[in-house]
């Protein structure tokens, strides 16, 4: 995959409090994945984050402290993509319907779905509460952020021969040092205000020539919209 005080997400930084208002934490007694709020009642996450019981935690910054802005809402429906493939992580996307509507405010708000595929070189924001150490384990309490560029599909495929499908793309740095990591899965990759990616997989974290691999949300916009319509 499915990781110093200077290494956040890995190699990122402490997000400003509630500056990523669409970021959610999926909890089953412990934080296990991230997700993105796309409307008042629906969250996008990764297919491999599927569990039968999930509590969605919105408005979080420090996941170990009640800071007063949180909304904890149980999942009413959890819908993994019908073509999700556990062995290849193709179609690694999932929708969660909340049992009640989120209260939208300055600290909890939605992120737009993409209107075009991610363009090479575009700078994106990746966030999550995953491991912040590329070697060893250091799980942060506070949300971590990383600015990283979309890599070309050619570089992505060269990094992972035979493993990259058209539903995946790479974001990050071939020199290593900055990446998402264990615990970030399902979380957002936002480029120009649109949810372009879902944290999915990678060979280790922040390793040279092994960038993070993300689900290409653009390919699933129709599925997302149809699924929400069929389950409203």
């Amino acid at each position: 995959a499915p990781f110093d005080d200077d290494d956040k997400i890995v190699g990122g930084y402490n997000c400003e409090e509630n500056s990523v208002p669409y970021q959610v934490s999926l909890n089953s007694g412990y934080h296990f994945c991230g997700g993105s709020l796309i409307n008042e009642q629906w969250v996008v996450s990764a297919g491999h984050c599927y569990k039968s019981r999930i509590q969605v935690r919105l408005g979080e910054h420090n996941i170990e402290v009640l800071e007063g802005n949180e909304q904890f809402i149980n999942a009413a429906k959890i819908i993994r993509h019908p073509q999700y493939d556990r062995k290849t992580l193709n179609n690694d996307i999932m929708l969660i319907k909340l049992s009640s509507r989120a209260v939208i405010n300055a600290r909890v708000s939605t992120i737009s779905l993409p209107t075009a595929p991610p363009a090479t070189g575009t700078k994106c924001l990746i966030s999550g509460w995953g491991n912040t150490a590329s070697s060893g384990a250091d799980y942060p309490d506070e949300l971590q952020c990383l600015d990283a560029p979309v890599l070309s599909q050619a570089k992505c495929e060269a990094s992972y021969p035979g493993k990259i499908t058209s539903n995946m793309f790479c974001v990050g740095f071939l020199e290593g040092g900055k990446d998402s990591c264990q615990g970030d899965s399902g979380g957002p990759v936002v480029c120009n205000g649109q949810l372009q990616g879902v944290v999915s997989w990678g060979d280790g974290c922040a390793q040279k020539n092994k960038p993070g691999v993300y689900t290409k949300v653009y390919n699933y916009v129709k599925w997302i919209k149809n699924t929400i319509a069929a389950n409203s």
């Epitope: 499915p2 296990f32 984050c49 039968s52 992580l89 384990a137 264990q182 997989w201 280790g204």
Partner: antibody
């Protein structure tokens, strides 16, 4: 193919620390999750915990206060320490590799075990 | 903690018989259920993962089904080499095993 071999003292005194090492051969330890499981004689299996080669760990809540796992990728080994042992810790201890295909997904979840060591018997007795 | 209740704890059947073992979870675990075979003095061997998927190299007489809380493991035609103890295992939240089912030949 990947093979696992547990090693360590077969006899540990009560209140001391049990230390075991699992050596991975025939493949790289990198980018996988690795488990420890134990089985008292004539009884069922009990999961002890899991470590990723990044060093991240999850332990069985009932054993968490006594368990420490570590990994040494340069030696292709991972280790288990269980402190303050009693006779109830007498068992066959197994190491195993996680079932996840790559060990590359970035979630915190659990899968199962597809490759196991042959097990090593540890007796706790004075 | 999720508890796994396996039944029966032991059974005796003839060669060629159909053998069924059940496993019940204390809460919904989706399909995060694996089945293992353990022969005396040996380590467990994975047979079925995600409730119904046959591990590579495992004979097709072994199968699994179920979702949620109730799961079934079947040997369609018992062979002498199938004498072993079989365990279910949930992986939905941490990992726990069932108590095991010892299968013997009549």
């Amino acid at each position: 193919q990947v093979q696992l071999q547990e090693s360590g003292p077969g006899l540990v005194k009560p209140s001391e620390t049990l230390s075991l090492t699992c050596t991975v051969s025939g493949g790289s330890i990198s980018s996988h999750y690795w488990h420890w499981i134990r089985q008292p004689a004539g009884k069922g299996l009990e999961w002890i915990g899991r470590i990723h080669t990044s060093g991240s760990t999850f332990y069985n809540p009932s054993l968490k206060s006594r368990v420490t796992m570590s990994v040494d990728t340069s030696k292709n080994q991972f280790s288990l320490k269980l402190s303050s042992v009693t006779a109830a810790d007498t068992a066959v201890y197994y190491c195993a590799r996680d079932l996840t295909n790559y060990g590359w997904s970035k979630s915190i979840r659990f899968y199962g075990m597809d490759v196991w060591g042959q097990g090593t018997t540890v007796t706790v007795s004075s | 903690d999720i508890q796994m209740t396996q039944s029966p704890s032991s059974l005796s059947a003839s060669v060629g018989d159909r053998v069924t073992i059940t496993c019940q979870a204390s809460q919904d675990i989706s399909n995060y259920l694996n089945w293992y075979q353990q022969k005396p003095g040996k380590a467990p061997k994975l047979l079925i993962y995600d409730a119904s998927n046959l591990e590579t190299g495992v004979p097709s007489r072994f199968s699994g089904s179920g979702s949620g809380t109730d799961f079934t493991f079947t040997i369609s035609s018992l062979q002498p080499e199938d004498i072993a103890t079989y365990y279910c295992q949930q992986t939905d939240n941490f990992i726990t095993f069932g108590g095991g089912t010892k299968v013997e030949i009549k």
